[in-house]
Amino acid sequence: AVNGTSRFTCFYNSRANISCVWSQDGALQDTSCQVHAWPDRRRWNQTCELLPVSQASWACNLILGTPDSQKLTAVDIVTLRVMCREGVRWRMMAIQDFKPFENLRLMAPISLQVVHVETHRCNISWKISQASHYFERHLEFEARTLSPGHTWEEAPLMTLKQKQEWICLETLTPDTQYEFQVRVKPLQGEFTTWSPWSQPLAFRTKPAALGKD
């Protein structure tokens, strides 16, 4: 059960959570594994139980404190180990010296709302969640709009290369139902990746005024 291809990936949400995924081809579903976190300059150690999320994949969250507390900085190093039970002993399956601000994945943006909607335009705002104050304005966003008869994958990506928590969508069709999503990424970190997409916000453009083209 230990000879398959394995992969261990973790991301820091910039505040008080390190989320990890451990995958291993050929591993037994009932294998008992944990992630151990051992920081270099903090008094705490943390462990989380890896729970199955698919046939050969397990995940867990290291909760370091209250959601908005700043538990790690750019100078911290947290050694992360995957330990799996083999009979009566634990075997180390993976180890990495984790630099939190090189491996960022923020929470999805929240509180999406329509600020103003017209026949052809819609102004939408959102908020970032549990994002470190260290970033100041060094964030970027991607947004996409789902049009009728299309899929999310077909939706063109709009890039906002600055910390701008609103967008004005234009050239929309009157009296039409749309959905909108946004995601965020810090500029910092070699292995940093996009946040999950926000929950979709549904909105409808105003109908065209009667008697006008």
Partner: nanobody, 126 residues
């Protein structure tokens, strides 16, 4: 581009010591796990030791455990292998190797290596 340049090899008598160095460039050294591997004449590549990005985790092949020490200096972007109590069977070309991520997998130490240097010859003979 990634470059790994080994040095410090040479000829030594059994029981002697050598310290190998590997100068790395072209990538953020501290973000990657590293290892030493070796190839004896007429043999395949053999894993020797691995180290995590900041040296907080190290691992050794049974054949060198207690005699070799892997370490790194991230300020100088350099990997080291201190070899003590050398034996004739340690004779090989020693290569420094970079892993493709910050993660090292102890059950499969060869996995994930994406670059290695040109090697430095170590000969142990009386």
């Amino acid at each position: 581009q990634v470059q790994l340049v080994e040095s410090g090899g040479g000829s030594v008598q059994p029981g002697g010591s050598l310290r190998l160095s590997c100068a790395a460039s072209g990538f953020t050294f501290s973000n990657y796990a590293m290892s030493w591997v070796r190839q004896a004449p007429g043999k395949g590549l053999e894993w020797v030791a691995s180290i995590t990005g900041f040296g907080r985790g190290t691992d050794y092949a049974d054949s060198v455990k207690g005699r070799f020490t892997i370490s790194r200096d991230n300020a100088e972007d350099t990997l080291y292998l201190q070899m003590n109590s050398l034996k004739p069977e340690d004779t090989a070309v020693y290569y420094c190797a970079k892993y493709s991520s910050s993660t090292y997998y102890p059950p499969t130490p060869a996995r994930g290596r994406d670059y290695r240097g040109q090697g430095t010859q170590v000969t142990v003979s009386s």
